[in-house]
Interface confidence: low
Amino acid sequence: APRGTQAEESPFVGNPGNITGARGLTGTLRCQLQVQGEPPEVHWLRDGQILELADSTQTQVPLGEDEQDDWIVVSQLRITSLQLSDTGQYQCLVFLGHQTFVSQPGYVGLEGLPYFLEEPEDRTVAANTPFNLSCQAQGPPEPVDLLWLQDAVPLATAPGHGPQRSLHVPGLNKTSSFSCEAHNAKGVTTSRTATITVLPQQPRNLHLVSRQPTELEVAWTPGLSGIYPLTHCTLQAVLSDDGMGIQAGEPDPPEEPLTSQASVPPHQLRLGSLHPHTPYHIRVACTSSQGPSSWTHWLPVETPEGVPLGPPENISATRNGSQAFVHWQEPRAPLQGTLLGYRLAYQGQDTPEVLMDIGLRQEVTLELQGDGSVSNLTVCVAAYTAAGDGPWSLPVPLEAWRPGQAQPVHQLVKEPSTPAFSWPWW
């Protein structure tokens, strides 16, 4: 600390006192000095360092009428809401002429009930799932010993004998409260009470039970929920977007999900009104009176293809001599999948039917056998996807070609020479 250059009498007539108190205490330190002539500015030191931003006030009172008479100077340093950082040795410093004078030190100490640096926080945990709680306290005076309480019951026989800063809880089956007591020579401080809400565990093994083109039946295994029965489970389904995708850990789906609630048990739900042959992502969470579990990861699922819901449209069958030209248009009804092609069946009055797989073409030319005298020839067409055939069209009779009708030129498809088959089937 700065000192006077001579063993001259100190101008300080009052030195800072000592303050010892608990956190939050408000106190004032004072220095008083009597000087002759113009009064100096008083600086405050803490542990030898000038406090540049000290909350101090200086009062100057002349003791005579002449400027050269003595002045009394009082400087007050206000400490509001005492904190650990405020503790230390305080002194006042003045410059008089070519000399520096420092007051006797005063001490600010913090002593009282323990102070919590960290307290247990409210949180939710899954039933029977381990977790940790934290509590940290300090004096002075030290030492500070901690005692944990669960539902107001101590978890150790005496402070300092149980877990200290971190409490490991192996799992809970009911919502509980935890608090922490900090003990030192001055007494006991109790932390806030943290409520640990026990939620159901995340469901496991979300899987598909069955698939239909517009319906998925899913099931899952519920997690433990402690003493609280599950009230329901919530399933969310969202259309997958190949461009975006849903990562396993992504918190929210890319669009508004379709949400369904399932009464439990059984832990199964039929999701209807879906699009056929469409990828979805699904997830499930289960709820008890305490709240919902966390969601499962998004599970990619896909509705299977269905068969077309209607037959091909506008079928026409025209005969010209020994050739028959058949053409049609794609079904207006939903295909429920990827159209793989068409099947055509034709049959005469006294001849077996013939089934043909036309692929994706919408027309075919049949080369009829013999002299073309096959009677009452009818044609049926069905569209198919990977799931199978859609409904067959009603039989369309072969009409004689009339001059003026357009008849495109097509490569010929020979009819099998000795067909004898039953009605189309796939």
Partner: antibody
Framework: EVNLVESGGGVVKPGASLKLSCEAS????????MSWVRQTSDKRLEWVAS????????YYLDNVKGRFIISRENAKNTLYLQMSSLKSEDTALFYC?????????????WGQGSSVTVSS | VIVMTQSHKFMSTSVGDRVSITCKAS??????VAWYQQKPGQSPKLLIY???TRHTGVPDRFTGSGSGTDYSLTISNVQTEDLAFYYC?????????FGAGTKLELK
């Protein structure tokens, strides 16, 4: 994994009967059309018969019509070929095959075959 | 009946070569042609359907092409494991018919 296992082959005299079975696993049997295809000693493949997934539609090669019956039991995942009035020209290795989903007349998986010998 | 003709009973090749096996249909089968590979003691395996669609798991050195009545299976960079019988089949209409087969062998 798709698996097809034929059984029931053997050596018989002309005019006798024989029933082949094909046990399927690894896929939803009732969703697929199934076929029997035979292979003669000269390595030629010849389609014999086909049946729809539900079993309601059957198709036969001309020269087995009336002698062979293709059937299926979906509850048992099994395909059958009942052969009667067997002829020496029916001697072959008979394969059971699954119809491909994208074209039911193309066969995407085949069994290992069951040998049928018709000889006096 | 649609007749499928494989004009070559045998085709010789060397490892690393490119070879094309051909098949002709007696009438237009609108690309409804499948190709199968059969190795000795094994059952046939589907390689190609609808003339050019590769079946699951088939190496991309196998390529199918064709339309109308003319079809071919091309194997580029032939490997020793490709030595086998190859059959074409029309899956256009019943009765389903196969080609007589082409045996691919080493020169």
């Amino acid at each position: 994994e798709v698996n097809l296992v034929e059984s029931g082959g053997g050596v018989v005299k002309p005019g006798a009967s024989l029933k082949l079975s094909c046990e399927a696993s690894g896929f939803t049997f009732s969703n697929y059309g199934m076929s029997w295809v035979r292979q003669t000693s000269d390595k030629r493949l010849e389609w014999v018969a086909s049946i729809s997934g539900g079993g309601g539609r059957t198709y036969y090669l001309d020269n087995v019509k009336g002698r062979f019956i293709i059937s299926r039991e979906n509850a048992k995942n099994t395909l059958y070929l009942q052969m009667s009035s067997l002829k020496s020209e029916d001697t072959a290795l008979f394969y059971c095959a699954r119809g491909a989903r994208a074209s039911y007349f193309a066969m995407d998986y085949w069994g290992q075959g069951s040998s049928v010998t018709v000889s006096s | 009946v649609i007749v499928m003709t494989q004009s070559h009973k045998f085709m010789s090749t060397s490892v690393g070569d490119r070879v094309s096996i051909t098949c002709k249909a007696s009438q237009d089968v609108t690309t409804a042609v499948a190709w199968y590979q059969q190795k000795p003691g094994q059952s046939p395996k589907l390689l190609i359907y609808w003339a050019s669609t590769r079946h699951t798991g088939v190496p991309d050195r196998f390529t199918g092409s064709g339309s109308g009545t003319d079809y071919s299976l091309t194997i580029s960079n032939v490997q020793t494991e490709d030595l086998a019988f190859y059959y074409c089949q029309q899956h256009f209409t019943t009765p389903l018919t196969f080609g007589a087969g082409t045996k691919l062998e080493l020169k």
